[in-house]
Interface confidence: low
């Protein structure tokens, strides 16, 4: 079950006490505090693109910005997997890739990003207002999901930009650089807090979470910081879900796949408490912590399909061959 952690409410300083500089020095610690709190928080980005050549063909790209190891990626449409969404593809770093129509090709782009091409013909083809979601199960961060759809006025060939474009390839240097800045910020924050020790700190609203209840963090995005701050997706768009989606179809791919059924119709799903925030105008992106592993090495709850893939020494990037030509 998801519960929402509250964003710290910044209380303005009492007027006349410190003036402009005082206001700035008091706000800065809380900006830094926010950064410190979210410093270790992984993010998921989603990019949805309609191909200019095939108007009903989509490319979905998703990436995970976290330090943990990815154990499973699930791509769904019509909403998050387990909340009305239908699985399009499942990618496992060791056991391979499984996909269903209208997915045409799912593949790993990097160790932490994937892409999925959807074909646009037939009854089960996507349309412009379809919501696509990517869920990354990782250890130790847990399960994180993001959703995206084309902006309302997308021209063919254009795409909703990926959420954190500047850090799409978060290599070690980048991670260390960001970590260094954040570390410095946190130290500076502590210094500032000590200086303001005589003034009572603004109270953080308590989070309705417990160790057993995974949290969903909601951070309001600004134009300047959209790379790091995301808004949980509010409405699940199913208006374009074709009727045929209730039965999914394995569809093309590496020769080492096996059948991949799920328990979507049987497994109990906890109620999802989604933040009621509208979709950002520049494309819909979400970063929602969907829960932590109950035990190391166990599949996180509600990651969707039970993965039944055939291990292959070539790894998940071997995309040649039709399904099942073993």
């Amino acid at each position: 079950m998801r519960t929402e952690a509250q964003v710290p409410a910044l209380q303005p300083p009492e007027p006349g006490l410190e003036g402009a500089m005082g206001h700035r020095t008091l706000v800065l610690p809380w900006v830094l505090l926010t950064l410190c709190v979210t410093a270790g928080t992984p993010e998921v980005w989603v990019q949805v693109r309609m191909e200019a050549t095939e108007l009903s063909s989509f490319t979905i790209r998703c990436g995970f910005l976290g330090s943990g190891s990815i154990s499973l990626v699930t791509v769904s449409w019509g909403g998050p997997n387990g909340a009305g969404g239908t699985t399009l593809a499942v990618l496992h770093p060791e056991r391979g890739i499984r996909q269903w129509a209208p997915a045409r090709q799912a593949r790993w782009e990097t160790q932490s990003s994937i892409s999925l091409i959807l074909e646009g013909s037939g009854a089960s083809s996507p349309c412009a207002n379809t919501t696509f979601c990517c869920k990354f199960a990782s250890f130790p961060e847990g399960s994180w999901e993001a959703c995206g759809s084309l902006p309302p006025s997308s021209d063919p060939g254009l795409s909703a930009p990926p959420t954190p474009a500047p850090i799409l390839r978060a290599d070690l240097a980048g991670i260390l650089g960001v970590s260094g800045v954040l570390l410095f910020g946190c130290v500076y924050l502590l210094h500032l807090l000590r200086r303001h020790k005589h003034r009572p700190a603004p109270r953080l609203q308590p989070s309705r979470t417990s160790p057993q209840a995974p949290r969903a963090r909601a951070w309001a995005p600004s134009q300047a910081s959209q790379a790091a701050l995301h808004v949980p997706y509010a409405t699940i768009n199913t208006s374009c879900r074709p009727a045929t989606l209730d039965t999914a179809h394995p569809h093309g791919g590496p020769s080492w796949w096996a059948s991949l059924p799920t328990h979507a119709a049987h497994r109990p799903q906890g109620p999802a408490a989604w933040a009621s925030t509208p979709i950002p105008a520049r494309g819909s992106f979400v970063s929602v912590e969907n829960g932590l592993y109950a035990q190391a090495g166990e599949r996180p709850p509600h990651t969707g399909p039970g993965l039944t893939l055939f291990p292959d020494p070539r790894g998940p990037r071997a995309m040649e061959g039709p399904l099942g030509v073993r």
Partner: antibody, heavy 120, light 107 residues
């Protein structure tokens, strides 16, 4: 009512081939994988492979891959398994069973079985 | 290939007793396991899927449990129609191997 009706018993000579049919009815044929399972007399079950009628995709147990071929005819909602180069080791009852894709992860309906006897 | 070790191989019990059959798997299959019952000369029938889910029509005296590499099938208050052979099968990577079976006989 869901039914998987298999073809009758076969008596074949060593080295020959046999084709077993599995006629599905009572459900949407293309929504389910068809699996094939071997059971030698008094022995456990051995999974041979599956085929997905929607697109003909298939998966095999490596042990049977070179000998068994799985096909489907969606127009007649029938699945086929051909076994080549038969030996006495292939004498067994062969079952077809269905598995709902992305749902059950189990074989929820089985055919009645087809007995194949390989003898000269 | 994933190995499925079922135990015991055979079991002689009386009606009304409770039975536990276990299936040990050579690697973590993340609850992708089914149990079947097969009576002499008949096709197998699904009892449990996803390690612990009962399909419609299966009596509630049957229950499945387990995770990781250890799974079990429990039959409470055994009935005369429950006698037969029980098999586990995994669905985690082909080949979807079966256990060796557990033959349940009337004492």
């Amino acid at each position: 009512e869901v039914q998987l009706q298999q073809s009758g018993p076969e008596l074949v000579k060593p080295g020959a081939s046999v084709r077993i049919t599995c006629k599905a009815s009572g459900y949407t044929f293309t929504d389910y994988n068809i699996h094939w399972v071997k059971q030698s007399h008094g022995k456990s079950l051995e999974w041979i492979g599956y085929i997905y009628p929607y697109n003909g995709g298939s998966g095999y147990n490596q042990k049977f891959k070179s000998q068994a071929t799985l096909t489907v005819d969606t127009s007649s909602t029938t699945a086929y398994m051909e076994i080549r180069s038969l030996t006495s080791e292939d004498s067994a009852v062969y079952y077809c069973a269905r598995e709902e894709v992305r749902r059950d992860e189990a074989l929820d309906f089985w055919g009645q079985g087809t007995s194949v006897t390989v003898s000269s | 290939d994933i190995q499925m070790t079922q135990s015991p191989a055979s079991l002689s019990v009386s009606v009304g007793e409770t039975v536990n059959i276990t299936c040990r798997v050579s690697e973590n299959i993340y609850s992708n396991l089914a149990w079947y019952q097969q009576k002499q000369g008949k096709s197998p029938q699904l009892l449990v899927y996803g390690a612990s889910n009962l399909p419609d029509g299966v009596p509630s005296r049957f229950s499945g449990s387990g995770s990781g590499t250890q799974y079990s099938l429990k039959i409470n208050t055994l009935q005369s129609e429950d006698f037969g052979t029980y098999y586990c099968q995994h669905f985690w990577g082909t080949p979807y191997t079966f256990g060796g079976g557990t033959k349940l006989e009337i004492k």
